[in-house]
Amino acid sequence: DNPERYSTNLSNHVDDFTTFRGTELSFLVTTHQPTNLVLPSNGSMHNYCPQQTKITSAFKYINTVISCTIFIVGMVGNATLLRIIYQNKCMRNGPNALIASLALGDLIYVVIDLPINVFKLLAGRWPFDHNDFGVFLCKLFPFLQKSSVGITVLNLCALSVDRYRAVASWSRVQGIGIPLVTAIEIVSIWILSFILAIPEAIGFVMVPFEYRGEQHKTCMLNATSKFMEFYQDVKDWWLFGFYFCMPLVCTAIFYTLMTCEMLNRRNGSLRIALSEHLKQRREVAKTVFCLVVIFALCWFPLHLSRILKKTVYNEMDKNRCELLSFLLLMDYIGINLATMNSCINPIALYFVSKKFKNCFQSCLCCCCYQSKSLMTSVPMNGTSIQWKNHDQNNHNTDRSSHKDSMN
């Protein structure tokens, strides 16, 4: 029961703005240090902004409750979503495959990263901080955070492109099943997401520091090469640009093109013949758009706080504490909203898509294909399917079944 001692953070420029400080619940993991110390390069310790602790203490418990809720809802919701799409052949189509990919990315984050974060919140230290497993977790945690959000944004982009393609080539038809191009898209999305997350796995290390003499270790981004220094400098802008603006711009472009396409073909005779399918496609497009809007709302506060911190906040300013309190509060709210994005998609689909609502209800009671009554439903690709309890393969596909993804 030795008392500990005060802090030094190895040759690292430590500022007194942190997420959760240390809780870096979101994928936007910045350096994780003791936040009550500022160690500029001259090696002197600066006075602390005391409001920080009050905010940190309050959010420690709020974050824990929210994280546990997200863990349960996210695990049940995303796992159910995957089960629905996997178990029902009628649900296996292009857009649903992308939604399943989205759900799997969220599920990985929820199951692996959230428990680590809750431990860090409650224990005030990194799990297994004195052995090699702690080092492994230190690299895995930010890697999975970035991978998960990468999977989210790239899947949202793919869904937007898919909606445009469905409208642009609506005269071509396709039955049930995941198109090869969609499968390649999904594999590419996952590979690219993992590649883009590699700098996190490289840069995050267990950095030793002292607090009142006792040696502690914490997981933080510690640039040791020119590339990692560059990555650390541009990280907030890169995250904002690629992981936030890009999916929104992508959606805006392809939804504008889709609208133009629909307006251009407004008077076509074929459009009248396929009016029901167009209606269904609009529903699917609305669902995808809803997912993008939810993503934007969940991530905007966190990105905004990071950009403001990068551009407005000056740690050497004597009057910085008020701004710091505001940014820290905004950061914590942003972290919780961003984390909620990992569990909110199944909920959104439940409310936006009648098809998913029916399947969720069936699956949570028992599961979709075990429904006792004959069930007629409209899958997300707009193809009308009928099936009975035990005959999953007895699909009676509407003859004007159409294309929602490239063959």
Partner: antibody, heavy 115, light 112 residues
Framework: DVHLVESGGGLVQPGGSLTVSCAAS????????MSWVRQTRDKRLELVAT????????YYSDNVKGRFTISRDNAKNTLYLEMRGLRSGDTAMYYC?????????WGQGTSVTVS | EVVMTQTPLSLPVSLGDQASISCRSS???????????VEWYLQKPGQSPKLLIY???NRFSGVPDRFTGSGSGTDFTLKISRVESEDLGIYYC?????????FGSGTELEIK
């Protein structure tokens, strides 16, 4: 047994300089943070300066920042406080203390009078 | 800075009585590493301060079990269950969670 012995105090004129030392024994000096704490005549205690184990990071109270310098020589097991631009408000008993999550051992103190 | 407000300034007690000293901080004193660095020191007449309690409630080696530290967040208390003559002196609370580290103004424990 842990022993901390301060020395170097005395009478100095305002604006003058003085360096007080603290000789440590009975423990591995290089593995502990160290601090200087002063006590004025009204019995109030103030943490003046603190230094980490390797001397790489230091902290000073606002009252002494820019005038005092804390340093350590781990080879000699000695802590130093160099005081420049002394003022009458710096008159106090100066204690060195070992910091291990708390200031668990203190020296007997050395008196500094600025007059 | 974090202000440590110690009450009372003077505490007259009879030997064998219980004594209680309060210390209120202007800010939360939980450090990011989960610890709360609140300490209690006793300075007997003509001596240097001695550590009694660290991290709110941990007794330092050699400190009698009649000394008990408690509290959390911003409110902290030192209790002495049965005051003995050797306990007389000035008690200081201290926070080492956030720079600048600060002491309370002190409470003098004296015989009634």
């Amino acid at each position: 047994d842990v022993h901390l012995v301060e020395s170097g105090g005395g009478l100095v004129q305002p604006g003058g300089s003085l360096t007080v030392s603290c000789a440590a024994s009975g423990f591995t000096f290089s593995t502990y943070g160290m601090s200087w704490v002063r006590q004025t005549r009204d019995k109030r205690l103030e943490l003046v300066a603190t230094i980490n184990t390797n001397g790489g990071n230091t902290y000073y109270s606002d009252n002494v920042k820019g005038r005092f310098t804390i340093s350590r020589d781990n080879a000699k097991n000695t802590l130093y406080l160099e005081m420049r631009g002394l003022r009458s408000g710096d008159t106090a008993m100066y204690y060195c203390a070992r910091d291990y999550g708390a200031m668990d051992y203190w020296g007997q103190g050395t008196s500094v009078t600025v007059s | 800075e974090v202000v440590m407000t110690q009450t009372p300034l003077s505490l007259p007690v009879s030997l064998g009585d219980q004594a209680s000293i309060s210390c209120r901080s202007s800010h939360y004193l939980v450090h990011d590493n989960g610890n709360t660095y609140v300490e209690w020191y006793l300075q007997k007449p003509g001596q240097s301060p001695k550590l009694l309690i660290y991290k709110v409630s941990n007794r330092f080696s050699g400190v009698p079990d009649r000394f008990t530290g408690s509290g959390s967040g911003t409110d902290f208390t030192l209790k002495i269950s049965r005051v003995e003559s050797e306990d007389l002196g000035i008690y200081y609370c201290f926070q080492g969670s956030h720079f600048p580290f600060t002491f309370g103004s002190g409470t003098e424990l004296e015989i009634k």
